[in-house]
């Protein structure tokens, strides 16, 4: 949807982040083997081992 575009572009091309359309925010992608501690992680400390 058009209103998502400007926000989505801020994450574009950054493999460590993704754009969550539901919360309309750029989120940090937890590395494999780690799990998020919140719905839209913002930094590596928002990821932990299960």
């Amino acid at each position: 949807f058009p209103q998502d575009r400007p926000f989505e572009d801020t994450c574009h091309g950054n493999p460590s982040h993704y754009y969550d359309k539901a919360v309309r925010r750029c989120c940090y992608r937890c590395p494999m083997g780690l799990f998020p501690t919140q719905q839209c992680p913002q930094r590596p400390t928002d990821c932990r081992k299960q």
């Epitope: 969550d20 919360v23 989120c27 992608r29 799990f35 998020p36 501690t37 719905q39 299960q50």
Partner: nanobody, 123 residues
Amino acid sequence: QVKLVESGGGSVQAGGSLRLSCAASGYIYSSNCMGWFRQAPGKEREWVARIHTGSGSTYYADSVKGRFTISQDNAKNTVYLQMNSLRPEDTAMYDCAAGRVVLGAVVCTNEYWGQGTQVTVSS
């Protein structure tokens, strides 16, 4: 990279049924979620339902509880949304999302999105 492809949308009369499919390809996290969102023109995107694919636990928005059922076919890496007793207010673009279960919570990240499938319910 995970790719999500939705299908099954269309036009239906009020009271009718549709079944949406969301096929996932690529790497899928072992502790993951797949869910459905919808957005009607001029309205906010709304969460509809999700399934925690490891445990099979399902969750629904109050607006669809008792009418919609989310299920999975692990062999096909596909999640389905069976929509019964459809109402005109269910008209929207339906998006599939995939992500990981948040530790200590029943919510999920929404890391991957499909392109959406349109559902139109007429009275």
